[in-house]
């Protein structure tokens, strides 16, 4: 019985120090835990250093360029978050572009596909609205993504839509049968057909970068 | 004695536990102890990267002001909501807005104020190259913020800064004296100078935000 | 009916100036295409100039180009051809002509209008 | 020098079927419509084909056009003593933005 009781008194004092043991190596772990994070931290902030040391050096060695790129860097850097690229109009679901040149329908269909953009669609009398106020201050003619084959066959935009007939009246070569098919543009406020070889402004229309930031 | 032999063997096996914990702890400290060496090691590698880093930077800011802007604007430019509002263009630093409507200098002022910025000023030769772009397509007279009380005043801008000769030439009725000043207009790709009383289209500029979210 | 009538045509000294109207009656003016074409005595048909419904489309004959000034007034159904610096070989009767499309072919034609260019 | 070439002159005794042809290049011809003009002495042209071989109404069916390549030309069967004029070709040349016409083709019924 006096055995028992000495027994039973070393055992609780081993139990509570492997008790202590434990909470030590528990307290440990979690000092190892947040040592490990604050080393993937440190690594994290020395690849961002070094990172930032390297670009810091290639600057320093193009700076005879960088004027020249300012311009393309920024439209590089920037798209991924601007609604549209530099240059062009934002206007609520998409961004258009008005041509600097003068060149014919497929031309000016080409020019819009090379930038990831097609040539103006007019979904409702809205857009019409804000194109008709932002060419107010032209009298020349754009090319809007609308054409036709010949006057036997619908108006269509370039995605194969039909064009929805209370949205304008097309005037002028309605009538015209062409070799190179028959192409809307707009003028003034007013929609005109006309032979598709003729050169003019353009209008390119892309939707907007409007995902969440 | 079964008690006893069962709390000898409970003891023995408590006293294993105990030892080996001590292991772990011994062990657990020798890594702890690594890790804060390899973490001074880190921290002075940081310090070392960022010396450098600190080195590089004070060598590019003695560099021309607008290599050092590329790399704010880029900084900037990384994580940016739209950079313009709706109907705007955005190009390079700088919003522009085309008014849609024909007014008095004075007036085309007051509505570019209203909407947080002044009337068009033209920096620099790139600056007068995106304009005269922009524009290529009206045949219409832009009012910009350019404007000066009499022929024997200089030209200055809304900011009160002079216009840099080199940029442009004024053409027109630059020696004309009118009881509301003489005010500049782009008009394709020239600069004129005319009555700042007669109605003209606009041009409205501000700071795109460039600003890091 | 389909109606043009010009009108501005006479004698000029070279180098100077005249003005020539054609008044258009009897179809939607906006919905077509005008042109100028000139017919020098004894010879053929020149095309002068060309202007699309509202202006935006214009060209010249090579000949012209710099001289002659093609515009029109919707609201008067009416088209001018202002011709400046004018030359012996400008002499011809200017006819102006209705197209249904800018590059296609002239279904009306005006009586035209005699200018003579001499000193 | 006109941009299109047509023979000076063409004859043809009544009833009989004559053609003008008209000669232009890809830019013209090659790539657009052709219209023709009849031009009676003393007025001023009146047209008598469109889109190559479209007549418009009240123009006789003795009268068609027809296109090859670069070549268009004119036909009229059963040559009437009224038909003798001056005719026209035309066409748009997208090169050079402008509208070209033939130097014209006298044509005599004889007889």
């Known amino acids: 019985s006096q055995v028992s009781n000495l027994l039973k008194q070393q055992q609780t004092n081993l139990t509570h120090q492997k008790n202590k043991l434990e909470g030590q190596i528990s307290a440990r772990q979690q000092a190892e835990e947040a040592s490990q994070e604050s080393q993937n931290e440190l690594k994290e902030m020395i690849e961002t250093l070094a990172w930032k040391l390297n670009e810091k050096s290639k600057e320093q060695m193009e700076l005879h360029h960088q004027n020249l790129n300012l311009q393309e860097t920024l439209k590089r850097v920037a798209n991924c978050s601007a609604p549209c690229p530099q240059d062009w109009i934002w206007h609520e679901e998409n961004c258009y572009l008005f041509s600097t040149g003068s060149f014919n329908w497929e031309k000016s269909q080409e020019k819009c596909l090379s930038l990831d953009a097609k040539l103006l669609k007019i979904n409702s009398t809205a857009d019409l609205d804000f194109i008709q106020q932002a060419i107010s201050y032209s009298s020349f003619p754009f090319w809007m993504g609308l054409s036709r084959r010949n006057p036997s066959y619908p108006w269509l935009w370039e995605d194969g839509s039909p064009l929805m007939p209370h949205l304008f009246r097309i005037r002028g070569a309605v009538s015209q049968t062409y070799p190179s098919g028959t192409c809307a543009y707009i003028q003034r406020g007013a929609v005109y057909a006309e032979n598709c070889i003729l050169a003019a402004f353009s209008i390119c229309q892309k939707k907007a970068n409007l995902r969440a930031q | 004695s079964q008690v006893s032999n069962l709390l000898k063997q409970q003891q023995t096996n408590l006293t294993h536990q105990k030892n080996k914990l001590e292991g772990q702890i011994s062990a657990r400290q020798q890594a702890e102890e690594a890790s804060q060496e390899s973490q001074n090691e880190l921290k002075e590698m940081i310090e070392t990267l960022a010396w450098k880093l600190n080195e590089k930077s004070k060598e590019q800011m003695e560099l021309h002001h607008q290599n050092l802007n590329l790399q704010e604007t880029l900084k900037r430019v990384a994580n940016c909501s739209a950079p313009c509002p709706q109907d705007w263009i955005w190009h390079e630093e700088n919003c522009y807005l085309f008014s849609t409507g024909s007014f008095n200098w004075e007036k085309s002022q007051e509505k570019c104020l209203s909407l947080d910025a002044k009337l068009l000023k033209i920096n620099s030769t790139a600056d007068l190259d995106f304009i005269q772009q922009a524009i290529s397509y009206s045949s219409f007279p832009f009012w910009m913020g350019l404007s000066r009380r009499n022929p024997s005043y200089p030209w200055l801008w809304e900011d009160g800064s002079p216009l840099m000769p080199h940029l442009f030439r004024i053409r027109g009725a630059v020696s004309q004296t009118y009881p509301s000043g003489t005010c500049a207009y782009i008009q394709r790709g020239a600069v004129y100078a005319e009555n700042c009383i007669l109605a003209a289209f606009s041009i409205c500029q501000k700071k795109a935000n460039l600003r890091a979210q | 009916q389909v109606q043009l009538l010009e009108s501005g045509g006479g004698l000029v000294q070279p180098g100077g100036s005249l003005r020539l109207s054609c008044a258009a009656s009897?179809?939607?003016?906006?919905?077509?295409?005008l042109h100028w074409v000139r017919q020098a005595p004894g010879k053929g048909l020149e095309w002068v100039s060309v202007?699309?419904?509202?202006?935006?489309?214009?060209y010249y004959a090579d000949s012209v180009k710099g001289r002659f000034t093609i515009s029109r007034d919707n609201s008067k159904n009416t088209l001018y051809l202002q011709m400046n610096s004018l030359r012996a070989e400008d002499t011809a009767v200017y006819y102006c002509?209705?197209?249904?499309?800018?590059?296609?072919?002239?279904?009306?034609w005006g009586q035209g209008t005699l200018v003579t260019v001499s000193s | 020098q006109s941009v299109l070439t047509q023979p000076p002159s063409v004859s043809g005794a009544p009833g009989q079927r004559v053609t003008i042809s008209c000669s232009g290049s890809s830019s013209n011809i090659g790539s657009n419509y052709v219209s023709w003009y009849q031009q009676l002495p003393g007025t001023a042209p009146k047209l008598l084909i469109h889109?190559?071989?479209h007549r418009p109404s009240g123009v006789p069916d003795r009268f068609s056009g027809s296109k090859s390549g670069t070549s268009a030309s004119l036909a009229i069967t059963g040559l009437q003593a009224e038909d003798e004029a001056d005719y026209y070709c035309q066409s748009w040349d997208y090169e050079s933005e402008r509208v070209v016409f033939g130097g014209g083709t006298k044509l005599t019924v004889l007889g």
């Open positions: 009897g179809f939607t003016f906006s919905d077509y295409a």
């Open positions: 202007i699309s419904y509202q202006g935006g489309f214009i």
């Open positions: 889109s190559t071989s």
């Open positions: 002509a209705r197209s249904p499309g800018l590059t296609s072919y002239h279904d009306s």
